[in-house]
Amino acid sequence: EVEKTACPSGKKAREIDESLIFYKKWELEACVDAALLATQMDRVNAIPFTYEQLDVLKHKLDELYPQGYPESVIQHLGYLFLKMSPEDIRKWNVTSLETLKALLEVNKGHEMSPQVATLIDRFVKGRGQLDKDTLDTLTAFYPGYLCSLSPEELSSVPPSSIWAVRPQDLDTCDPRQLDVLYPKARLAFQNMNGSEYFVKIQSFLGGAPTEDLKALSQQNVSMDLATFMKLRTDAVLPLTVAEVQKLLGPHVEGLKAEERHRPVRDWILRQRQDDLDTLGLGLQGGIPNGYLVLDLSMQEALS
């Protein structure tokens, strides 16, 4: 807290300019009018105030706007945004995507801070859904943004927004998140032809059910092993050896290197050894010839 003292003669600020960087904190408090500061916020970012001086400027704005800053001020906060607490930000009503971009720019290159997370939350809640432009903006600044949302939050993403998602945006998503995103992606890309569709849907396949994988196996997609390894184990298990061979195409040889890892390991255990042998990869661990496989889960369902 800066002590209240009278402004020295001749030091009253008539505009926000570079001369103010030479003011001590108490001089800024005494000589800068809060209303002047609010109308000339766009200048603050270009002036190299120290963080301590920015504290004083924030204090002046807080006194002027105790209920929260108007968007005209928020849009021009610049470095002053770094001084805001999540509590401050919760008082704001940010509706413009330009404002959001301006503030994200200040934090660019850093991890998502609690302030940024609160800002995004306020913005998205204000819009009611995560529309394409917003998602585009957020994933441009924070590629992992989508995967930081809960499955419940992801359910508000309209399928049209999926076009904004890049493969790297899904890198840290877990299966529960992909379960929500996959049906949206399927809907978004449904009018594309086979090979183009596969390119777009590939990153989302960690949420695909068995029937969709079976359908893909009929389309000569040549799925790479990295994508195959991210598929849901429960979706892969019912696939036949022939279906997996068609799904992977020339990449089928990669199964040997992954035979000890899920989902390949679990899938091998469910296949007849005879069928596995047809691949000529030396995969071991299948069901020996002559053994009968009882699907107990099916039996339980019938009883």
Epitope: I21, P48, F49, Y51
Partner: nanobody, 115 residues
Framework: EVQLVESGGRSVQAGETLRLSCTAS????????MGWYRQAPGDECELVST???????NYADSVKGRFTISQDNAKNTVYLQMTSLKPEDTAIYSC?????????WGQGTLVTVSS
Amino acid sequence: EVQLVESGGRSVQAGETLRLSCTASGFTFDDSDMGWYRQAPGDECELVSTISSDGSTNYADSVKGRFTISQDNAKNTVYLQMTSLKPEDTAIYSCRTMASRIGCWGQGTLVTVSS
């Protein structure tokens, strides 16, 4: 990693002259606006002088006409020439890139002016 090392501070009598140096490394010196800050015991940090990448300079009212800031890009060094020193100039002097927005922080170099 940005490094700034200040030197040249010592005890002098009022009216004497002193030159402080600040040698920089870890960033593009010629493109940076630099500043000298000072903090007197029990007082708050204040900016004394700045020099921009184009060579233009600015000074706090309290040192105008007495202090001169300059830089040598070849040596990655910024200087503060202080003349007609007064007891109220006693402080720890630090140099900073203006973009860092940090002000008084770190070691600095101590200037003591006695009357």
